[in-house]
């Protein structure tokens, strides 16, 4: 597994922050784990990166992800409730120049090396629908969230608000 070495917390140096012409409102490093406390890890295999969901051995170091948070403005004519709305979007980068991507055709979550500006598939709408947990909804496919399936990350369709608390789309962020 790999992390981001030699990077200070809250760094802004790793990534040029002019993604799609907007600067992130904040960035920081955190480890990502599931609702059931399994760790999300990243491994280089055959020159491509694989993403795993696994139990770490005691004292095994958690992989860190650089989360970059963006504010997205929704005009009232789009928001449907007569007021301009803002939402938080996030990109997730476990190592320099690589970002998590939604592959909507394959219903998969992949790591891709990217040029700026990042494509929409690298952006996820942030939800916190449950105490101290977050969910990541595809910008490109509303109602589809990053989730856990067979010890891997996958894209999971959530068809009603009751299912927004399904444990397999809930994640915990930890800076320790």
């Amino acid at each position: 597994a790999f992390g981001i070495s030699g990077v200070q917390k809250y760094t802004r140096a790793l990534h040029d922050s002019s993604i799609t012409g907007i600067s992130p409102i904040t960035e920081y490093l955190a480890s990502l784990s599931t609702y059931n406390d399994q760790s999300i890890t990243f491994a280089l295999e055959d020159e491509s990166y694989e993403i795993y969901v696994e139990d770490l051995k005691k004292d095994e170091k958690k992989d860190k992800v650089l989360l970059s948070y963006y504010e997205s403005q929704h005009p009232s004519n789009e928001s449907g409730d007569g007021v301009d709305g803002k939402m938080l979007m996030v990109t997730l980068s476990p190592t320099k120049d690589f970002w998590l991507h939604a592959n909507n055709k394959e219903h998969s979550v992949e790591l891709h090396k990217c040029e700026k500006p990042l494509p929409d598939q690298a952006f996820f709408v942030l939800h916190n629908m449950h105490s101290n947990c977050v969910s990541f909804e595809c910008k490109t496919d509303p109602g589809v969230f990053i989730g856990v399936k067979d010890n891997h990350l996958a894209l999971i369709k959530v068809d009603s608000s009751e299912n927004l608390c399904t444990e397999n789309i809930l994640f915990k962020l930890s800076e320790t």
Partner: antibody, heavy 121, light 107 residues
Framework: QVQLQESGPGLVKPSETLSLTCTVS????????VHWIRQPPGKGLEWLGV???????SYNSALMSRLTISEDISKSQVSLKLSSVTAADTAVYYC???????????????WGQGTLVTVSS | DIQMTQSPSSLSASVGDRVTITCLAS??????LAWYQQKPGKSPKLLIY???RLADGVPSRFSGSGSGTDFTLTISSLQPEDFATYYC?????????FGQGTKVEIK
Amino acid sequence: QVQLQESGPGLVKPSETLSLTCTVSGFSLSKYGVHWIRQPPGKGLEWLGVLRAGGTISYNSALMSRLTISEDISKSQVSLKLSSVTAADTAVYYCARDHYYYSSFGGFASWGQGTLVTVSS
Amino acid sequence: DIQMTQSPSSLSASVGDRVTITCLASQTIATWLAWYQQKPGKSPKLLIYAATRLADGVPSRFSGSGSGTDFTLTISSLQPEDFATYYCQQLYNTPYTFGQGTKVEIK
């Protein structure tokens, strides 16, 4: 125009249940979380709980056994019930709306005017 | 629960003064911190969110800084309408706790 309006009895007897309603307009409860906060006279703010945009509810664990938050989406209302009240529950009760869709990370952008509830026999 | 400690609890200042209020979190909260202003008999008003972002309609003399555990609200040149009580709040974990407040009074 975003508006939140608290309503309910201003006087509640000890050991009874305090019931308040927050009626919202200008935004959708399916997109924004609504929080309850209280402020005892002359004191600071205490977060009580939230009805999140997806319909889930989070409570302050210190009050969880006495607190119930619910919604009536058709009436655009969020309700708070606090059971077994004592004089220590005397406070101005506020409801407030999240700054961001779907997320509480941005704080509370809009507040009701607050309603004073006195617990006394 | 995350404890939020504000200092000072009160301060006296004159119009035109630069005022700084600090907020210390008992554990890291990244940048998920908000600042509110409250005047007597009124509801709190959001000033700053995500530690540094100015809320809509808030004058630019207000600014926020910090990340992790240490945060600051600065009023660059105090105006008569700024005399009020200021609260910080963490939004990293529930319960979303507030600081105890800082009352800014006229000297």
